[in-house]
């Protein structure tokens, strides 16, 4: 039975040209995290594997940095970066937990962080 929950940074906004940290946190489970995948729609951005460390997909190497922790830092944001991002926690023995973050990249300086929320 999967008892864990993923807490994410939720709906967030940031300014064009700036950077943002995507964060997820898995709680309420003793399952071992073997790998975390970060995806944007159907594109793999990065992997953090417990044995091998971080791997950034080649097409994102210039604008994506690992961390902090299991989070992901997006740099040099463009309006095209607006959309859904997913943290996918592969765990043993529970299986897979997925968290969702919606990022809106704004032209102006009115970007504000949204509230944190939980996905069961």
């Amino acid at each position: 039975m999967m008892t864990g929950t993923i807490e994410t940074t939720g709906n967030i906004s940031a300014e064009k040209g700036g950077s943002i940290i995507l964060q997820c946190h898995l709680s309420s489970t003793t399952a071992q995290v073997t790998q975390v995948n970060w995806e944007q729609q159907d594109q793999l951005l990065a992997i953090c594997n417990a044995d091998l460390g971080w791997h950034i997909s080649p097409s994102f190497k210039d604008r994506v940095a690992p961390g902090p922790g299991l989070g992901l830092t997006l740099q040099s944001l463009t309006v095209n970066d607006t959309g859904e991002y997913f943290c996918i926690y592969h765990t043993y023995p529970d299986g897979t937990y997925t968290g969702r973050i919606f990022l809106e990249v704004l032209e102006s300086s009115v970007a504000e962080h949204g509230a944190r929320f939980q996905i069961p």
Epitope: Q35, I47, N49, D51, L52, G53, W54, H55, P66
Partner: antibody, heavy 117, light 107 residues
Framework: EVQLLESGGGLVQPGGSLRLSCAAS????????MSWVRQAPGKGLEWVSA????????FYADSVKGRFTISRDNSKNTLYLQINSLRAEDTAVYYC??????????WGQGTLVTVSS | DIQMTQSPSSLSASVGDRVTITCRAS??????LNWYQQKPGKAPKLLIY???NLRSGVPSRFSGSGSGTDFTLTISSLQPEDFATYYC?????????FGGGTKVEIK
């Protein structure tokens, strides 16, 4: 005893292919990520490729991407490295290594690949 | 890719000497830094993992320290069997990268 034993090296012409094998014993092979590291004659160590325990994810150095393929058969306790389109600069001793705590804790004795016409 | 710079590239020392080898990463790698020893014609051997953890079976005269970008391997009292080449390696992100090596020779 925990052991890794490489085989499959040899002399090959530029553009040729080889398949390296690494037979594991003494531990639960499928529970560990594995990697290949090479060392050109008289040079330092260069990480080549790695694969997760299940085989579900594979990773490569830019210098070999598209030419080398790492794979594993957990039922046979064996790691493989298929190396194609070989170049003179691929001449090296190739080591397989077990990964634990994000380090290569057990190494094989190495197998020499020589690329020459 | 993360570059690892090791120094010195070689050193001469006597049995009983205290030897220090340094390794610098081009960006922070937290403590994902390993040290290996290699003797001629042999495979590398893991000495220290995660910057400061001594691998089981490795003599306690070997120690590692550091975090972020700067790391040190220390041999407190050099023994005859310690003459070898030492490599640092980062495992924070792929591709894993090694330092150029430090050859420890007999003075």
């Amino acid at each position: 005893e925990v052991q890794l034993l490489e085989s499959g090296g040899g002399l090959v012409q530029p553009g040729g292919s080889l398949r390296l094998s690494c037979a594991a014993s003494g531990f639960r092979f499928g529970n560990y990520a594995m990697s290949w590291v090479r060392q050109a004659p008289g040079k330092g160590l260069e990480w080549v490729s790695a694969i997760t325990g299940s085989g579900g994810n594979t990773f490569y150095a830019d210098s070999v991407k598209g030419r080398f393929t790492i794979s594993r058969d957990n039922s046979k306790n064996t790691l493989y490295l298929q190396i194609n389109s070989l170049r003179a600069e691929d001449t090296a001793v190739y080591y397989c290594a077990r990964v634990r705590n994000r380090a290569s804790d057990i190494w094989g004795q190495g197998t020499l690949v020589t690329v020459s016409s | 890719d993360i570059q690892m710079t090791q120094s010195p590239s070689s050193l001469s020392a006597s049995v009983g000497d205290r030897v220090t080898i340094t390794c610098r990463a081009s960006q922070t790698i937290i403590t994902y830094l390993n040290w290996y020893q290699q003797k001629p014609g042999k495979a590398p051997k893991l000495l220290i993992y995660a910057a400061s953890n001594l691998r089981s079976g490795v003599p306690s005269r070997f120690s590692g320290s550091g975090s972020g970008t700067d790391f040190t391997l220390t041999i407190s009292s050099l023994q005859p069997e310690d003459f070898a080449t030492y490599y640092c390696q980062q495992s924070y992100s792929l591709p894993w990268t090694f330092g150029g090596g430090t050859k420890v020779e007999i003075k």
